[in-house]
């Protein structure tokens, strides 16, 4: 599975959108987890509402928010007030019992604001108004890693 690299500015919000086959993943909750090391386990950060039909409701854990549009097949994760410590490898997952299927691998990179408190122009987006999409500077790196469907114990 290819890894998508998303860059966000420190102090701002970074929004990650993971798309999936809505029929294939019907009835399955979604989760956002942080991978501990290249081959390590993926530590759950936040998952969608326990009642699948309410998955559109935002669930928050700390500064991370998740919501799932189950009809469109898009789960959206927002990392608010991005900090240097948020950088790392993450996964969007589709859950089924003790199994977790990787929908997308995401490498989050945090950029320090080179202008400090000065006007950052088009790149600086106040958190209140909208999220820094990351897609503006998104690129993919092919890692040719197979999608796995391991138990999440």
């Amino acid at each position: 599975l290819n890894t998508t690299v998303l860059q966000g500015m420190a102090g701002q919000s970074l929004r990650v959108s993971c798309t999936y086959d809505a029929l294939k993943h019907w009835g399955r909750r979604k989760a956002w987890c942080r991978q501990l090391g290249e081959e390590g386990p993926c530590q759950r950060v936040v998952s969608t509402h326990g009642v699948w039909l309410l998955a559109f409701l935002k669930k928050r854990n700390g500064s991370t928010v998740i919501a799932d549009d189950t009809l469109a097949g898009t789960v959206t994760i927002t990392l608010k007030n991005l900090q240097a410590g948020d950088a790392g490898l993450y996964q969007c997952q589709s859950l089924r019992g003790r199994e977790a299927e990787v929908l997308q691998k995401v490498l989050v990179e945090v950029l320090e604001d080179p202008l400090d408190d000065q006007d950052a122009g088009d790149l600086w987006v106040p958190e209140e108004s909208s999220s820094f999409e990351g897609a503006q500077v998104e690129h993919s790196t092919s890692r040719n890693q197979e999608t796995s469907f391991p138990p999440t114990s």
Partner: antibody, heavy 123, light 107 residues
Framework: EVQLVQSGAEVKKPGESLKISCKGS????????IGWVRQMPGKGLEWMGI????????RYSPSFQGQVTISADKSISTAYLQWSSLKASDTAMYYC????????????????WGQGTMVTVSS | EIVLTQSPATLSLSPGERATLSCRAS??????LAWYQQKPGQAPRLLIY???KRATGIPARFSGSGSGTDFTLTISSLEPEDFAVYYC?????????FGGGTKVEIK
Amino acid sequence: EVQLVQSGAEVKKPGESLKISCKGSGYSFTSYWIGWVRQMPGKGLEWMGIIYPGDSDTRYSPSFQGQVTISADKSISTAYLQWSSLKASDTAMYYCARAGHYDDWSGLGLDVWGQGTMVTVSS
Amino acid sequence: EIVLTQSPATLSLSPGERATLSCRASQSVSSYLAWYQQKPGQAPRLLIYDASKRATGIPARFSGSGSGTDFTLTISSLEPEDFAVYYCQQSSVHPYTFGGGTKVEIK
């Protein structure tokens, strides 16, 4: 009527290749997972693997990984099970079955089964 | 992989009697357990899924119970057509293994 129709019985020699089929009808073939199950003569059921025809996402039981290939052609609503080099121990009845229940709150329920394909491998 | 152990291997009963079949998992499978019936020369048929939910068209005399590692399939009053082999299957963790089966035969 929802049904899975499998290809006919096969008699093969060791070392030969084989591809058996399972054609779905009466439902949206691409929206349900299809599992394959082996039953050796006089024995129980063995799980081989599962495929989602919508995108050909496939999972194998470790016992069958590398021994068989599971595939699907969604354009003709057909799933396949194939061997590149058959062994006498592959002699068995092979079933395909639809996973009608398979989500976060519901376990796998193979609710529609094919009639089975008997594969005999003998020199 | 998860191992399912069914007991007894054979159950000899008369029509009208109650049949109790057991399936034990080597580790918890939550309620992700299904039961199938297979008659000679036929494909298996789904009876119960999610440990206790009857599949479409299955008579009320078939019931399932249990969660975690211990499960039971009960046939409240055996009909002549119920004499067959019964298999449990877990779908908690892939591979979705089957139990070895319990044969319910006429006494």
